[in-house]
Amino acid sequence: AWELTILHTNDVHSRLEQTSEDSSKCVNASRCMGGVARLFTKVQQIRRAEPNVLLLDAGDQYQGTIWFTVYKGAEVAHFMNALRYDAMALGNHEFDNGVEGLIEPLLKEAKFPILSANIKAKGPLASQISGLYLPYKVLPVGDEVVGIVGYTSKETPFLSNPGTNLVFEDEITALQPEVDKLKTLNVNKIIALGHSGFEMDKLIAQKVRGVDVVVGGHSNTFLYTGNPPSKEVPAGKYPFIVTSDDGRKVPVVQAYAFGKYLGYLKIEFDERGNVISSHGNPILLNSSIPEDPSIKADINKWRIKLDNYSTQELGKTIVYLDGSSQSCRFRECNMGNLICDAMINNNLRHTDEMFWNHVSMCILNGGGIRSPIDERNNGTITWENLAAVLPFGGTFDLVQLKGSTLKKAFEHSVHRYGQSTGEFLQVGGIHVVYDLSRKPGDRVVKLDVLCTKCRVPSYDPLKMDEVYKVILPNFLANGGDGFQMIKDELLRHDSGDQDINVVSTYISKMKVIYPAVEGRIKFSTGSH
């Protein structure tokens, strides 16, 4: 028998520095977690103690903090190289800055293979990107070899900016021939490493003949066997065992997100490459694990540029940006409109001639807007200003909801109106009219939404049975501020870009902004 240790991360999302327990900015260092310096300590400890160790990443290193905003992926290549990753799969967020924003900072600089079997380049890009990512790579490990085959969510064109010269194929259809190729090369131990979410990971384990282990990402799935060490609630045991169609037991793993845990899976193979046993658990990277001093020093060196960036002007406002709780928790506020407009703008994807865009709607809890921005400071808007407005380090995500769920959400928005509570929704691509004289749960008297399957966008009444795409904060997607119906009834959820980054990019693009209060949210006569 031959034993392999798989260490894995996924959805790190730019958390190079240690974070608080909820993966936001570290405040009390003695209680902070994760970060590449701490990760390196644990990885090195395991590499020294065990013979056959692979360190793998299942995608979405890009996007999530000011590190990515400033360094644009160079930080990912640098620190993943420093940690000596063995392979990485491309995630959807690796395309956030377009193909060039992937090629130059990451693909050309990474000293480890970057993989995806279901992304096929065409046209002029095919020769440009040739060899910079691979469908699979055979890794020598001790006296054996292990095949790693990559995959990426086929939804990437709707979630990011891969352009028109990359085709995202069905994962299972694309993976099978590559696994077959590995088999012809006499590689009998094969790991599928990818970024399509836990449901697809399980399908790959079930359907792709020859895959021995699946290491996934995208859905931020936390798996654990035994008593979990922090706040995350396990979605199942670690590893999650799938019985393949040809009768094999295939372990599937994922390690939550944000570098909070290091996935740790021990696999025992027989001489024919069959999995005999698999066991392990994610390792919580808490403060009991010291940060490696040399990596920490490097982090501090790279940090200097971030501090300078946060005070630079992004753009100007010529109007007061009203982000006060007195406005945003009671009525339409222009800061809410600005943020929603930025959220929609960030999700412009012309992937189908029938649609002007795949999504037109935005909702945003007023309680998430934490500060106004005064235009009387020469109109200057900085990252620092935006960090005061959006201090929680969240993301603006894409969900699919039925019209009936949206209606419930808007009822919840005003179910206890007047108490300055955070659930009051700011909107984009939506016209809502409330009648507060009616009883809670029946206060939405008009709800019109902007069409997407149209050449001239216009507002149509919401249809209860129709499925709509909506951009919203991850806080709402996870049922925050009492929006349990969103969490319970959403049909799809894809995590998006860092909130501040979305707004800062929009302001930089527009240069000068002047958002107005324009009648997106109305109250029917006599009730307000």
Partner: antibody, heavy 122, light 110 residues
Framework: EVQLVQSGGGVVQPGRSLRLSCAAS????????MHWVRQAPGKGLEWVAG????????YYADSVKGRFTISRDNSNNTLYLQMNSLRAEDTAVYYC???????????????WGRGTLVTVSS | QSVVTQPPSASGTPGQRVTISCSGS????????VNWYQQLPGTAPKLLIY???QRPSGVPDRFSGSKSGTSASLAISGLQSEDEADYYC???????????FGTGTKLTVL
């Protein structure tokens, strides 16, 4: 400036041993994989052996397996090739080369030493 | 004998475009990236192309690489007398668990 200074070549009888050294400077030696490549007189290049950044993984051409050992001393920035049971067909110029990467199997040889001649003859 | 083959010689006149081919198998070129090295007479080899088609800084854009399936090629346009050298392709081989060099091509500028 990257420099790879080689030493240890010479004339040796078949069956005997020789150790080649390659002193590296101008880069962080411990961050990169290293290789030995040889070239017999009038012939093409033949990769001989490679070693990962920390010495944890070593790779050999079939023609030298069991006879040659690649090693490194990261504290002294030096790469070695211990050649035992030498044969006439091992006669070649031996080049030390720096890998662009750390693993030894993924990357390219971006800097080369000038080479040292090893002649195996009775 | 080498598992990666190249034509032993190639030639062209100054200003011409020449192409050197490199043929391997699924375990080397088919699965891994290709690098090209130039060896001028009496000197050590020098990296010319890496990752199929990437040029290190200092290498003129007259040199370009490409890969398709289990074959690769090096193209030199606007041939110059100083391009007269031996050219080698190379790739990692997954079956041999080692690096393999092509047989080499001697380029003569007529």
């Amino acid at each position: 400036e990257v420099q790879l200074v080689q030493s240890g070549g010479g004339v040796v009888q078949p069956g005997r041993s020789l150790r080649l050294s390659c002193a590296a400077s101008g880069f962080r030696f411990s961050d990169f994989a290293m290789h030995w490549v040889r070239q017999a007189p009038g012939k093409g290049l033949e990769w001989v052996a490679g070693i990962s950044y920390d010495g944890g993984n070593k790779y050999y051409a079939d023609s030298v397996k069991g006879r040659f050992t690649i090693s490194r001393d990261n504290s002294n920035n030096t790469l070695y090739l211990q050649m035992n049971s030498l044969r006439a067909e091992d006669t070649a110029v031996y080049y030390c080369a720096k890998d662009h990467g750390y693993s030894g199997y993924y990357g390219h040889l971006d800097y080369w030493g000038r080479g040292t001649l090893v002649t195996v003859s009775s | 004998q080498s598992v990666v083959t190249q034509p032993p010689s190639a030639s062209g006149t100054p200003g011409q475009r020449v192409t050197i081919s490199c043929s391997g198998s699924s375990s080397n070129i088919g699965s891994n990236t290709v690098n090209w090295y130039q060896q001028l007479p009496g000197t050590a080899p020098k990296l010319l192309i890496y990752s199929n088609n990437q040029r290190p800084s200092g290498v003129p854009d007259r040199f370009s690489g490409s890969k398709s399936g289990t074959s690769a090629s090096l193209a030199i346009s606007g041939l110059q007398s100083e391009d007269e050298a031996d050219y080698y392709c190379a790739a990692w081989d997954d079956s041999l668990n080692g690096r393999v060099f092509g047989t080499g091509t001697k380029l003569t500028v007529l």
